[in-house]
Interface confidence: low
């Protein structure tokens, strides 16, 4: 089970919204807090270790997931071509 602890939004830049989200999850052994279908979820810890972010299915149904080149996060591409970028810190 997971709950969102903080959610900050910054819409000051044109055509770009920056959102920072922190979630707290109670996960089983071998799992860790992650994102599934754009919501906080418990995911296999190996996904986080190997930075294979797309393996936790972070995008919404119908969106395409692609790793950022240096594995610092992922992009979700909507059918219309709009891209949402998520970085992990």
């Amino acid at each position: 089970t997971c709950e969102i602890v903080t959610l900050d939004r910054d819409s000051s830049q044109p055509r770009r919204t920056i959102a920072r989200q922190t979630a707290r999850c109670a996960c089983r052994k071998g799992q860790i807090a992650g994102t599934t279908r754009a919501r906080p979820a418990c995911v296999d810890a190996r996904i986080i270790k190997t930075k294979q972010w797309c393996d936790m299915l972070p995008c919404l149904e119908g969106e395409g997931c692609d790793l950022l080149i240096n594995r610092s996060g992922w992009t979700c591409t909507q059918p219309g071509g709009r891209i949402k970028t998520t970085t992990v810190s």
């Epitope: 930075k51 395409g64 692609d66 790793l67 950022l68 080149i69 240096n70 594995r71 610092s72 996060g73 992009t75 591409t77 891209i83 970028t85 970085t87």
Partner: antibody, heavy 114, light 110 residues
């Protein structure tokens, strides 16, 4: 890493270049094709993932196709060649952890001329 | 389309000087940048990946820094053998930006 297949061709002719690797497997490594026109800079053409997913530079889409033909060979198929495609073509192993290409072949020269 | 603006196009330095080459990306590339050295008639060799990670076997006088859209390759105490052309290669996602090389910087040692 070694490229082969470069030669003199006339405009409009298709050409396939082959990249042969040893010491590692294409089932776990990314491979990119890069070209360099005489006296010019480097130009990224595209990449093939271990899963065989391919991505291309916008200018290369449609005319260039990268495919894996075995666990040790990757091909670059080029169609509708023009004199602008005259270049040395390099095959390079790409790291899946960054944009770095850490192992390059010596290149193969393609000359397009009438 | 991602554009990598590399400056300067060429420079001349004396042995022992510090050389800086800059690459400016047209959009945030999330440290997805690598740096290469190329000598005449040879393929490029990787120096730095992920903006600041020194490739194994590369002398520690080479270093990379930067974030967002602004990145720098620094050669601290340049040596005669560092005469070459240097390229940055940037991009953050193969599917959206792909990879783009900078135009190159020709480094001459006086």
């Amino acid at each position: 890493v070694e490229e082969s297949g470069g030669r003199l061709v006339t405009p409009g002719t298709p050409l396939t270049l082959t990249c042969t690797v040893s010491g590692f497997s294409l089932s776990s490594d990314y491979m990119s094709w890069v070209r360099q026109a005489p006296g010019e800079g480097l130009e990224w053409i595209g990449i093939i993932y271990p899963s065989t997913t391919t991505y291309y530079a916008s200018w290369a889409k449609g005319r260039f196709t990268i495919s894996k033909t075995s666990s040790t060979t990757v091909e670059l198929k080029m169609t509708s060649l023009t004199t602008e495609d005259t270049a040395t073509y390099f095959c390079a192993r790409g790291s899946n952890w960054s944009s770095g290409m850490n192992l390059w072949g010596p290149g193969t020269l393609v000359t397009v001329s009438s | 389309e991602l554009v990598m603006t590399q400056t300067p196009p060429s420079l001349s330095a004396s042995v022992g000087e510090t050389v800086r080459i800059r690459c400016l990306a047209s959009e945030d590339i999330y440290s997805g940048i690598s740096w290469y050295q190329q000598k005449p008639e040879k393929p490029p060799t990787l120096l730095i990946s992920g903006a600041s990670n020194l490739e194994s076997g590369v002398p520690p006088r080479f270093s990379g820094s930067g974030s967002g859209t602004d990145y720098t390759l620094t050669i601290g105490g340049v040596q005669a053998e560092d005469a070459a052309t240097y390229y940055c290669l940037g991009g953050y996602s193969y599917s959206s930006t792909g990879l783009t090389f900078g135009a190159g910087t020709n480094v001459e040692i006086k």
